[in-house]
Interface confidence: low
């Protein structure tokens, strides 16, 4: 069919020259030479199917994909990976051919599988296969740690079942809140698998290999603290071990905790308790609520009660399957250029969710936080007011979720003209979409007030450059203008621009420019 | 090239203490671990303990726990190990040795690729 | 602590033999096991690191094979210099653990 594009896919290896693990780097800077990957037709599939050769990638490389399309005037794309779909912006090479490309970062077992490229020209719309595996039959993994006791001692031990075998800490931290960032000289880290030490205010176990690193906070409640507003929550999967720790302080030793699940004592074997005097010289008590292995039953509200202060629960929801809740549709934002703006996105997940912000086929590093209902936020201010689609992409082992945000930024516009034999053309950035006049100078309008109607035509932005929305507009050469100056001002709420084209040969000639606010 | 240069030897009183110093020289002491190893008379290897001078985390075989010290001083590129409470039965060679993290079919494997020569601790009363 | 047993304790062989020491964990180490060599009144020497790899500069005779609980150390042809102790030991956790080791003589 000799209306198909001219398809070429190639796969472009990077040498990583951050090899530190779990940074989000924004663009690998070292590329290899591309290598060809053919994109045959496929046969016997409905509509136009290509398919590249299938592409092995070694754990932890970074990769693109790319697309070069021959194809005359604009093209839409989209990307479709296990289920979720990815805008793409393509942009133009030097022949004029379109690219569009997907950079994978760090290669990891999650990224692997099959990804389609929808592609849409102004004449035909294809799909293009690509088979991504890692290349490595040993598959790496990274589990989140979980907690065991120790056998005959008080004492958990922490565990990542990951390949290769995870470098294991626990993060212990003895203060409140913000001063228990991770990088807080308040934070003590031990390099161990096994903690006694367990009065600490927050504590935490982390693995890290070449995959990243994984932590897993010990669910506490305790009971010198206001209970929060609202009744702390704690998701598990169902198999996964439950543990719960309570703690008090008292004057004397003359106090005693307990467990209670839905108003019934914790069976014995399902709890241990662990006391010491603090420096000034108070009882400290730890009573650990602990299942092996949870099963559906074990759903409801856990209660610790202590005969000197006031109890505290928490709602314990054994789920079948890991989740990601948030709601997925898209937003858009217009903000002034020196705006300060921050995109958020506020999620309920378990597991844990990694995540990333993406902008114009760079990744930036993605920050959670917790908040007090259950909640957690991660926000991304690091636009630097360029305008655009950004993306929040997260995952945990059983969810995907994407949002897309737009971002708009509000200026004046600024025009760029072209002329040819037979027509001349302006394109103007600028938000709102800039609306377009063509006017004539001639001796009857020195000042170029005399408007042109017939043979103008507007396009609407549909396609972005850079991130910028970018409107046209295109006059055909009439007889009655040619070898006159027009003028073409694109004009929004926030100010006028103008260029002037002299319409009398091929090449461009623009050569004033107004600026008119 | 890579060597570990230990102090000379010791006789200790039972109950005493003794420290034991391991110089380094042709590299510096950011490889992932220093270890201590001893071997009494006529017996096999016995891991005593290790640290990562970086961080100066400390490991240490249960055996050992509360009577063995295990430091590193980065300036001087030296590790040393104290031992307290010394009874006959700790009367051994003790080596420092360092480790080595080298990788192979997407897993790193940890071992210790260069000893220094030893230092005999005889305990006696 | 995970235990290390070799076997044979000791045993003779010529020159030219094919020699295989064994080494047996208490629970699975998966690959993460060394094997070194040690020769009277001297410090031990890194052969085999991740149960097969041989360390550089160490003769090719040597080869390590086995995982999870069972391995083997085989020097296929003995050479004078190869009469010496053997000590596997474990460093997939800590605290690391040898054998006892097994004694290499001449017959």
């Known amino acids: 069919n000799q209306d198909l594009p001219v398809i070429k896919c190639v796969l472009i290896n990077h040498k990583n020259n951050d090899s530190s693990v779990g940074k989000s780097s924004s663009y690998p800077m070292v590329s290899e030479s591309p290598e060809d990957l053919g994109c045959a037709l496929r046969p016997q599939s409905s509509g136009t199917v290509y398919e590249a050769a299938a592409v092995e990638v070694d754990v932890s490389a970074s990769i693109t994909l790319q697309v070069l399309v021959d194809a005359p005037g604009n093209i839409s794309c989209l990307w479709v990976f296990k289920h979720s779909s990815l805008n793409c912006q393509p942009h133009f090479d030097l022949q004029n051919r379109g690219v569009v490309s997907m950079v994978i970062l760090k290669m990891t077992e999650t990224q692997a599988g099959e990804y389609l490229l929808f592609i849409q020209s102004e004449a035909t719309n294809y799909t293009i296969l690509f088979t991504v595996s890692i290349r490595n039959t040993l598959l790496y993994t990274l589990r989140r740690p979980y907690f065991r006791k120790m056998e005959n001692q008080d004492a958990l031990v922490c565990i990542s079942e990951s390949v290769p075998e995870p470098i294991v800490e626990w993060v212990l931290c003895d203060s409140q809140g913000e001063s228990c960032k991770e990088e807080s000289p308040a934070v003590v880290k031990k390099e161990e698998k096994v903690l006694h030490e367990l009065f600490g205010t927050d504590i935490r176990c982390c693995a890290r290999n070449e995959l990243g690193r994984e932590c897993t906070r010990l669910f506490t409640i305790d009971l010198n603290q206001t209970p929060q507003t609202t009744l702390p929550q704690l998701f598990l999967k169902v198999g996964e071990p439950l543990w719960i720790r309570c703690k008090a302080v008292h004057v004397n030793h003359g106090f005693g905790l307990t467990w209670e699940l839905e108003n019934k004592a914790l069976e014995e074997g399902n709890y241990f308790e662990m006391s010491t005097y603090s420096t000034n010289r108070t009882m400290i008590r730890i009573l650990f609520a602990f299942v092996s292995s949870v099963a559906r039953n074990d759903t409801g509200y856990y209660t610790c009660s202590s005969s000197k202060h006031p109890s505290q629960s928490a709602l314990v929801t054994i789920v079948e399957k890991g989740f990601i809740n948030a709601t997925n549709s898209s937003e858009d934002y217009e903000i002034d250029q020196y705006e300060e703006f921050c995109f958020s996105v506020r999620f309920k997940a378990y597991p844990q969710i990694r995540c990333t912000w993406t902008f114009s086929r760079k990744s930036f590093p993605c920050e959670q936080k917790g908040l007090d209902n259950g909640y957690s936020i991660s926000k991304f201010c690091n636009h630097k007011h360029q305008p655009g689609e950004y993306i929040f992409h997260a995952e945990n082992d059983d969810a995907q979720f994407t949002k897309m945000f737009t971002l708009n930024i509000r200026r004046k516009p600024q025009v760029l003209a072209e002329a040819s034999a037979s027509q001349a053309s302006c394109f103007s950035d600028g938000y709102p979409l800039p609306s377009w006049t063509w006017k004539k100078c001639s001796d009857k309008s020195p000042n170029c007030t005399e408007e042109i109607t017939e043979g103008v035509w507007n396009r609407k932005a549909n396609r972005k450059v850079f991130g910028q929305w970018v409107s046209s507009s295109t006059l055909n050469m009439s007889e009655a203008i040619k070898g006159f100056l027009v003028k073409c001002c694109a004009y929004n709420s926030l100010g006028t621009s103008c260029e002037t084209i002299l319409l009398n040969s091929p090449g461009p000639f623009p050569f004033i420019q107004d600026n008119i606010s | 090239q890579v060597q570990l240069v230990q102090s000379g030897a010791e006789v200790k009183k039972p109950g005493s203490s003794v420290k034991v110093s391991c110089k380094a020289s042709g590299y510096t002491l950011n490889e992932l671990f220093m270890h201590w190893v001893r071997q009494a008379p006529g017996q096999g290897l016995e891991w005593v303990g290790g640290?990562?001078?970086?961080?100066?985390?400390?490991f240490y075989a249960q055996t050992f726990q509360g009577r063995v010290t295990i430091t590193a001083d980065e300036s001087t590129s030296t590790a040393y190990m104290e031992l307290s409470s010394l009874r006959s039965e700790d009367t051994a060679v003790y080596y420092c040795a360092k480790g080595v993290r080298q990788y192979s079919y997407g897993r790193y494997y940890y071992g210790m690729d260069v000893w220094g020569q030893g230092t005999l601790v005889t305990v006696s009363s | 602590d995970i235990q290390m047993t070799q076997s044979p304790s000791s045993l003779s062989a010529s020159v030219g033999d094919r020699v295989t020491i064994t080494c047996r964990a208490s629970q699975s180490v998966s690959s993460y096991l060394n094997w070194y060599q040690q020769k009277p009144g001297k410090a031990p020497k890194l052969l085999i690191y991740?149960?097969?790899n041989l360390q550089s500069g160490v003769p090719s005779r040597f080869s390590g094979s086995g995982s999870g609980t069972d391995f083997t150390l085989t020097i296929s042809s003995l050479q004078p210099e190869d009469f010496a102790t053997y000590y596997c030991q474990q460093s997939y956790t800590t605290p690391w653990t040898f054998g006892q080791g097994t004694r290499l003589e001449i017959k």
């Open positions: 991740g149960a097969s």
């Open positions: 640290i990562i001078p970086m961080s100066g985390t400390t």
